[in-house]
């Protein structure tokens, strides 16, 4: 089983981009893109802070958390209203991602 | 370095409940999915179910209507329940944790396993 | 479900020699297959991720390939702690399903 060029595998995805900007307080924004070629009952989502293709349900009822979201490490927990999820480093600093 | 240790009764009544409890040191409950993996005498692996951490679940369709999975973060631990039990699910009983490598979920760390009977 | 076959069920070898194990998914599941070792007794070891990745700490000795349906599991100069029961496992889909088992033993 080939893949034709610009294909990609079954279940995996890839950046396409990566814009950072509005160095805001000392807060970095940065909105990321990704393609993905997710499997039946997947979607695309973030495992480990990279785009990653997950199970659909996690996307349905906003347990963002169960896309282990964060790197090995670091706690995560949702925001209020299921907006997104944070991700605390063991030094306590903390990444805030918000899903739009 | 995670470590995981299953515990639970050794022997159980047929039509009973078996209840197995997998206690995870070492590492955080709460960054993997966590996994039931059973093996009866001489045969080969048969996988029963996934616990994410929020406690959802997934589990082996031929076992889903015996099955239960659950998740205690305060405690970090995980619990099978497998309900009506006869037999046939005598077998060693492992736990494991299961790590995303970027997309190819794999079962890294197992405990070391528990027997359990299923016997009058 | 996915069934998973390997070939085959029983090898016989020496230490020192090359073997190759054959898994067989019935349906495409790209890269998403494991490999693990079990001796008597002990817990499954996982081996090889992503069809090909070797897992942190494994000998390099050992190798996985293949894509789609077709994958293998090669030791080159065995030793004797590689007697043991390898199973493939595909991750692609619920339930998970593992291979029946390949038993290497001592010629």
């Known amino acids: 089983q080939f893949l034709k060029e610009g294909q990609l595998a079954a279940g995996t995805c890839e950046i396409v981009t990566l814009d950072r900007c509005c160095n805001k307080n000392r807060r970095t924004i940065a909105r990321q893109t990704a393609r993905c070629a997710c499997r039946k009952g997947q979607i695309a989502g973030t495992t480990r802070a990279r785009p990653a293709c997950v199970d659909a349900r996690i996307i349905k009822t906003k347990q963002w958390c169960d896309m282990l979201p964060c790197l090995e490490g670091e706690g995560c927990d949702l925001l209020i209203n299921r907006s997104g999820w944070t991700c605390t480093q063991p030094g306590g600093r903390i990444k805030t991602t918000t899903v739009s | 370095q995670v470590q995981l240790q299953e515990s639970g009764p050794g022997l159980v009544k047929p039509s009973e409940t078996l209840s197995l409890t997998c206690t995870v040191s070492?590492?955080?409950?709460?960054?993997?999915?966590w996994s039931w993996i059973r093996q009866p005498p001489g045969k080969g692996l048969e996988w029963i179910g996934y616990i994410y951490p929020s406690g959802s679940t997934n589990y082996n369709p031929s076992l889903k209507s015996r099955v239960t999975i659950s998740v205690d973060t305060s405690k970090n631990q995980f619990s099978l329940n497998l309900k009506s039990v006869t037999a046939v699910d005598t077998a060693v009983y492992y736990c494991?944790?299961?790590?995303?490598?970027?997309?190819?979920?794999?079962?890294?760390?197992w405990g070391q396993g528990t027997t359990v009977t299923v016997s009058s | 479900d996915i069934q998973m076959t390997q070939s085959p069920s029983s090898l016989s070898a020496s230490v020192g020699d090359r073997i190759t194990i054959s898994c067989r998914a019935s349906q495409s599941i790209s890269t998403s297959l494991n490999w693990y070792q079990q001796t008597p007794g002990k817990a499954p070891r996982l081996l090889i991720y992503?069809?090909?990745t070797l897992q942190s700490g494994v000998p390099s000795r050992f190798s996985g390939g293949g894509s789609g349906t077709d994958f293998s599991l090669t030791i080159t100069s065995l030793q004797p702690e590689d007697f043991a029961t390898y199973y493939c496992?595909?991750?692609?889909?619920?339930?998970?399903?593992f291979g029946q088992g390949t038993k290497l033993d001592i010629k």
């Open positions: 494991a944790r299961v790590n995303p490598f970027g997309y190819y979920y794999a079962m890294d760390v």
């Open positions: 070492g590492g955080s409950i709460s960054s993997y999915y």
């Open positions: 992503g069809a090909s």
């Open positions: 496992q595909e991750s692609a889909s619920i339930p998970r399903t």
